[in-house]
């Protein structure tokens, strides 16, 4: 069993969250995850539903008795998220963590957003992904 | 040309981040979009960007002077992200909008937690890659 | 033209707060922009936050984001700026400015109209 399983049911007890009715009105994650069998697609969503799970263990991050419960959760959503790659990890800390209403933030967003655009479509990609695209075309015209 | 790039211009002129200094102490998105190359990763990433621009946008949602600015280039970001597909974009809207400070909220994801970690890691997405990948083992094993 | 009367400065030990008021009155305000700029003795004017008279648009200067927040009550014609976990590098005189709408400029020399200002200072 990993052990983020226990500490889970550790957040349970904690939070009161094993009842049924908590459950009422549908769920926050589960369905919304149910919906989308592509991969790329489930990381679009899982990185919003990983940035929301670590926003929330912030704002319990002075509690001692979900302490060692939270810590091990992290941990275990490093490794099943990111790989382990610490890398990987403080990149995406350090986009969920920019301000939106810091006006040297904003200023930049704004100074990079034409070619954080071009970058988007997964066609856009690499030069070499778009080649590769042409060439297929050009294989399939030519068949 | 894409007609986002006009309206980026536009923005750049209102939020005064056309200057070079804007680029000064490096880069917000552009820099961390440049270490990932795999698919997946890039869209745990964009995931981020993206949703801040859409906050962004929501701070200067009254504002006149460059409302069609900015919802030509909401328009263009679906197009370009969420291929257009609207299911796709409010599940995204959905996942943004959760608060983390709402008692209901905290318990249903902690409700949800086990399960949404089970789904992290690719290999858990679901049962018939793991079965594929389980007789990918059992063949290389027996050769 | 327009007229800006802010208020609500004073003394406050560091880590606490304030909130500064800025009533306008004369030609319809609602055409400009409403920021805060700030002076310290022996240093020049600096922008601290800027917002719209909808309520929309916030920006704040790097310094201050996420301890001040900056408002507006469109009935009572009136500004505001909250200030939480004030530090001892806040010891200022803070100005409320009308400022152009159609453009975000932290360049004190783009202001319109000035209040009178406001001193603030916080004790370590």
């Known amino acids: 069993q990993d052990p983020y399983v226990k500490e889970a049911e550790n957040l349970k007890k904690y939070f009161n969250a094993g009842h049924s009715d908590v459950a009422d009105n549908g769920t926050l994650f589960l369905g919304i995850l149910k919906n989308w069998k592509e991969e790329s697609d489930r990381k679009i969503m899982q990185s919003q539903i990983v940035s929301f799970y670590f926003k929330l263990f912030k704002n319990f991050k002075d509690d001692q008795s979900i302490q060692k419960s939270v810590e091990t959760i992290k941990e275990d959503m490093n490794v099943k998220f990111f790989n382990s790659n610490k890398k990987k990890r403080d990149d995406f800390e350090k986009l969920t963590n920019y301000s939106v209403t810091d006006l040297n933030v904003q200023r930049k967003a704004i100074h990079e957003l034409i070619q954080v655009m071009a970058e988007l479509s997964p066609a856009a990609k690499t030069g070499k992904r778009k080649r590769s695209q042409m060439l297929f075309r050009g294989r399939r015209a030519s068949q | 040309q894409d007609p986002y790039v006009k309206e980026a211009e536009n923005l750049k002129k209102y939020f005064n981040a056309g200057h070079s200094d804007v680029a000064d102490n490096g880069t917000l998105f552009l820099g961390i979009l440049k270490n990932w190359k795999e698919e997946s990763d890039r869209k745990i990433m964009q995931s981020q960007i993206v949703s801040f621009y859409f906050k962004l946008f929501k701070n200067f949602k009254d504002d006149q002077s460059i409302q069609k600015s900015v919802e030509t280039i909401k328009e263009d970001m679906n197009v370009k992200f969420f291929n257009s597909n609207k299911k796709k974009r409010d599940d995204f809207e959905k996942l943004t909008n959760y608060s983390v400070t709402d008692l209901n909220v905290q318990r249903k994801a902690i409700h949800e937690l086990i399960q949404v970690m089970a789904e992290l890691s690719p290999a858990a997405k679901t049962g018939k890659r793991k079965r594929s990948q389980m007789l990918f083992r059992g063949r290389r094993a027996s050769q | 033209q327009v007229q800006l009367q802010d208020s609500g400065g004073g003394t406050v030990q560091a880590g606490g707060s304030l909130r500064l008021s800025c009533a306008a009155s004369?030609?319809?305000?609602?055409?400009?922009?409403v920021g805060w700029f700030r002076q310290a003795p022996g240093k020049e004017r600096e922008f601290v936050a800027r917002?719209?008279?909808?309520?929309?648009?916030?920006s704040y200067a790097n310094s201050v984001d996420g301890r001040f927040t900056v408002s507006t009550d469109n009935a009572k014609n009136t500004v505001y700026l909250q200030m939480n976990s004030l530090k001892p590098e806040d010891t200022a005189i803070y100005y409320c400015a009308a400022l152009p709408s159609n453009i975000i400029t932290t360049d004190y020399l783009r202001v319109y109209y000035w209040g009178q200002g406001t001193q603030v200072t916080v004790s370590s």
């Open positions: 004369g030609r319809t305000f609602s055409d400009y922009a």
């Open positions: 917002i719209l008279w909808t309520g929309a648009s916030r």
